[in-house]
């Protein structure tokens, strides 16, 4: 095979174009200049290279950049990104959100791969915190992202980023994660008026303390039962019957259907029967 290592006459690639799809792997290796490839990476995606040919192109870039690719190359990797290993990606320094978006787009519709997870971790660590634009981007591609972070990692999320969080992004969060996110949301939305504030804070209320629930009960918020059932039991227990009635508004009738479930069950057991009777729902303490 040694005689094939030199580029045949007239085959040296002056640019990255469609003609290269007819090159054998050894010809790509011998005839494509790595520096040229790096400057014309944006063209690679438009050319229907085979997986084997992409392997050769990756190898050329690896030789040119043994310490890791520069961001100018990373941003234009396109489908070549799918050939990268987590070990490759750990060598990168990705700082541009546009680069992150471009690579997440390549993986769109697929489950998060180890490569993507490594890329995201590198990007977030490089930024030092999960800023709003980053969180916006990550949750758009992966709605469950926030709930896979530990409470400690979530503590580095600035309150301003909470504006990027949608209710569905919190669907799989556990109570300890909500304990961390709720105070940030409260701070983020503090300047909104009553009804608008409640709409925004609602999905974070699984982390709310008793005093905040008491305050909400004074604002005619009409909390639905689904939200009430997600509240912390220890936060609900001290509420009076009158406060729960104000908090739920017309939804208070739903307590009957949930009387055997926490936190309703535990709350009922804490109330005086006379007070429960004022609701007219037949709740038995």
């Amino acid at each position: 095979e040694v005689e094939k290592t030199a580029c045949p006459s007239g085959k040296k690639a002056p640019e990255i174009d469609e003609s290269l799809i007819f090159y054998k792997k050894w010809e790509l290796e011998a005839c494509v200049d790595a520096a040229l490839l790096a400057t014309q990476m944006d063209r690679v995606n438009a050319i229907p290279f085979t997986y084997e040919q992409l392997d050769v192109l990756k190898h050329k870039l690896d030789e040119l950049y043994p310490q890791g690719y520069p961001e100018s190359v990373i941003q234009h990797l396109g489908y070549l990104f799918l050939k990268m290993s987590p070990e490759d990606i750990r060598k990168w320094n990705v700082t541009s959100l546009e680069t992150l978006k471009a690579l997440l787009e390549v993986n769109k519709g697929h489950e998060m791969s180890p490569q993507v997870a490594t890329l995201i971790d590198r990007f977030v660590k490089g930024r030092g915190q999960l800023d709003k634009d980053t969180l916006d981007t990550l949750t758009a591609f992966y709605p469950g992202y926030l709930c896979s972070l530990s409470p400690e990692e979530l503590s580095s999320v600035p309150p301003s980023s909470i504006w990027a969080v949608r209710p569905q992004d919190l669907d799989t969060c556990d109570p300890r994660q909500l304990d961390v996110l709720y105070p940030k949301a409260r701070l983020a939305f503090q300047n909104m008026n009553g009804s608008e504030y409640f709409v925004k804070i609602q999905s974070f209320l699984g982390g709310a303390p008793t005093e905040d629930l008491k305050a909400l009960s004074q604002q005619n918020v009409s909390m639905d039962l689904a939200t009430f059932m997600k509240l912390r039991t220890d936060a609900v227990l001290p509420l009076t019957v009158a406060e729960v009635q104000k908090l739920l508004g017309p939804h208070v009738e739903g307590l009957k259907a949930e009387e055997r479930h926490r936190p309703v069950r535990d709350w009922i057991l804490r109330q005086r029967q006379d007070d429960l009777d004022t609701l007219g729902l037949g709740l038995q303490g």
Epitope: E111, A117, G144, S148, S150
Partner: nanobody, 115 residues
């Protein structure tokens, strides 16, 4: 597609100890929150504990000093060590994984605490 399979359920004496296991079908995930939940008859599912990819863990107050969550990455196994068991711990126990931003559930394993 990731799959979770719990095992180790059974009958335990009050005051006794027991360990549940959850086999995780893949090991290539990078970012995760692994959790244990339980559901007693006629009650809603209750979160018990979580372990996260940074190695930290969290517990519900009801089990804080009695239950311990652990993950053996080499064996792809999640565990729940339960001590000082009480009759009110009787439930179906489920493992849950929020892995690389998707949520998965096991089928559950029954634990009955009775003498």
């Amino acid at each position: 597609q990731l799959q979770l399979v719990e095992s180790g359920g059974g009958l335990v004496q009050p005051g006794g100890s027991h360990r549940l296991s959850c086999a995780v079908s893949v090991s290539t995930f990078t970012r995760y929150a692994m959790r244990w939940y339980r559901q007693a008859p006629g009650k809603e599912r209750e979160w018990l504990t979580s372990i996260y990819s940074d190695g930290s863990s969290a517990y519900a107050d009801s089990v804080k000093d009695r239950f311990t969550i652990s993950l053996d990455n080499a064996k792809n196994m999640l565990y729940l060590q339960m001590n000082s068991l009480k009759p009110e711990d009787t439930a179906v126990y489920y493992c849950n994984a929020n892995v690389d931003s998707k949520a998965y559930w096991g089928q559950g394993t029954q634990v009955t605490v009775a003498s």
